[in-house]
């Protein structure tokens, strides 16, 4: 049994880091493998993560963490029984993938303005809470070409757009994702999408 693709890990900078790797053949990850992880800190202990299958030869492990600070570094040991398959380290602050925003809502009752709001996925005491920026994706269910991205570079989790920038009388969907420049993070996963019917009063044409 050998590791074909070494573990790579990302942290949500809150309570979970996710490590993925591939074995050289079909593997029952949860029964055959264990990923031990330990914070490099005085009097810390090793903790065990039981991996799950992620495709035939792929494994994924969700490492529980108390919290994360930039100084943290973890040692990682991948074991198959008594055999050490791989040894490495992981610094969560250098591999951050933020949590996805939630509760995306489209408010259509604000005159002819669409107000999209969502929730910051972090509590106020988390460092990322005040460092997230967002991308909002809006697309038409009827027209695949009608697909747009709005970059929200301010901290408030909301976006206002004129309803007239979208076509009237058709349904749209929206989703949002987040990233943090301070840690050069990857983008989060997209939030679940929300749907609404776009309609607005066309202005009278003056002749």
């Amino acid at each position: 049994m050998k590791v074909l693709q070494e573990p790579t890990c990302v942290s949500d900078y809150m309570s979970i880091s996710t490590c993925e790797w591939k074995m050289n053949g079909p593997t029952n990850c949860s029964t055959e493998l264990r990923l031990l992880y330990q914070l490099v800190f005085l009097l810390s202990e090793a903790h065990t993560c039981i991996p799950e299958n992620n495709g035939g030869a792929g494994c994924v492990c969700h490492l529980l963490m108390d919290d994360v600070v930039s100084a943290d570094n973890y040692t990682l040991d991948l074991w198959a029984g008594q055999q050490l398959l791989w040894k490495g380290s992981f610094k969560p602050s250098e591999h951050v993938k933020p949590r996805a925003p939630g509760n995306l809502t489209v408010h259509t009752n604000v005159s002819d303005t669409l107000l999209l709001t969502w929730s910051n996925p972090y509590p106020p005491d988390n460092y990322l809470y005040n460092h997230l920026t967002y991308a909002v994706n809006i697309w038409s269910e009827n027209d695949p070409a009608d697909f747009r991205i709005y970059n929200v570079t301010y901290l408030e989790p909301s976006l206002r757009i004129a309803a007239s920038t979208l076509k009237s009388g058709i349904s749209y969907r929206a989703r949002v994702r987040a990233w943090a420049q301070c840690y050069n993070t990857t983008w989060s996963e997209w939030s679940p999408s929300t749907k609404w019917h776009n309609s607005y009063r066309e202005p009278f044409e003056q002749h």
Partner: antibody, heavy 125, light 112 residues
Framework: EVQLVESGGGLVQPGGSLRLSCAVS????????MSWVRQAPGKGLEWVSS????????YYADSVKGRFTISRDNSKNTVYLQMNSLRAEDTAVYYC??????????????????WGQGTTVTVSS | DIVMTQSPLSLPVTPGEPASISCRSS???????????LDWYLQKSGQSPQLLIY???NVAAGVPDRFSGSGSGTDFTLKISRVEAEDVGFYYC?????????FGQGTKLEIK
């Protein structure tokens, strides 16, 4: 009520051995790291050794490394310090102390908040 | 090793007056989680040491509120707002960020 009671001290010749014990009650022993600290006559405090709650992490002062062994028996709520090749400079009162919670991912520290009464080790010919 | 240096080594104080002890570490004892791994202990004559302050500023359970700790990084101070006769003994600072844990030389507080 938290209690730590050391025993096993005494008079021993240079090169001899002693095993100190520290019996603990009043808290969840296996969750906490434990430490030994000593104090030579008329001197200050000197850290000797520490062990994590599960026993997997062990640390020693350079002055005792290779001669002293710390261990614990969580079923007996007891931490031990096996002292071999004793020297005159090991003469001291030895205290055990309750250290940080070590079973969490990041050990949680509240100081060495409880100490035993100490046991005296005298190394002399 | 992190060297801890205390001053003064002797501190005669009049009861009711304030007292202050300084502790300096040769390297920072501040970890990235924002905590300073610096404690203060009092050892009264013939007794075991007792914890006064942990993580730089936190007063241990049962310790009178006349004791307080301050400082960060490498410079720390223990203050007693009004010294009482029962406060006599040796005061030690100790860092527990890295092994070996290291103590200051001790400050002897005595009543004038």
């Amino acid at each position: 009520e938290v209690q730590l009671v050391e025993s096993g001290g005494g008079l021993v010749q240079p090169g001899g051995s002693l095993r100190l014990s520290c019996a603990v009650s009043g808290f969840t022993f296996s969750s906490y790291a434990m430490s030994w600290v000593r104090q030579a006559p008329g001197k200050g405090l000197e850290w000797v050794s520490s062990i994590t709650g599960g026993g997997g992490g062990i640390y020693y002062a350079d002055s005792v490394k290779g001669r002293f062994t710390i261990s614990r028996d969580n079923s007996k709520n007891t931490v031990y310090l096996q002292m071999n090749s004793l020297r005159a400079e090991d003469t001291a009162v030895y205290y055990c102390a309750k250290d940080r919670i070590s079973i969490t991912i990041r050990p949680r520290y509240f100081g060495l908040d409880f100490w035993g009464q100490g046991t005296t080790v005298t190394v002399s010919s | 090793d992190i060297v801890m240096t205390q001053s003064p080594l002797s501190l005669p104080v009049t009861p009711g007056e304030p007292a202050s002890i300084s502790c300096r570490s040769s390297r920072s004892v501040l970890y990235g989680n924002g905590y300073n791994y610096l404690d203060w202990y009092l050892q009264k004559s013939g007794q075991s040491p007792q914890l006064l302050i942990y993580l730089g500023t936190n007063v241990a359970a049962g310790v009178p509120d006349r004791f307080s700790g301050s400082g960060s990084g490498t410079d720390f101070t223990l203050k007693i707002s009004r010294v009482e006769a029962e406060d006599v003994g040796f005061y030690y600072c100790m860092q527990s960020l890295r092994t070996p844990y290291t103590f200051g030389q001790g400050t002897k507080l005595e009543i004038k």
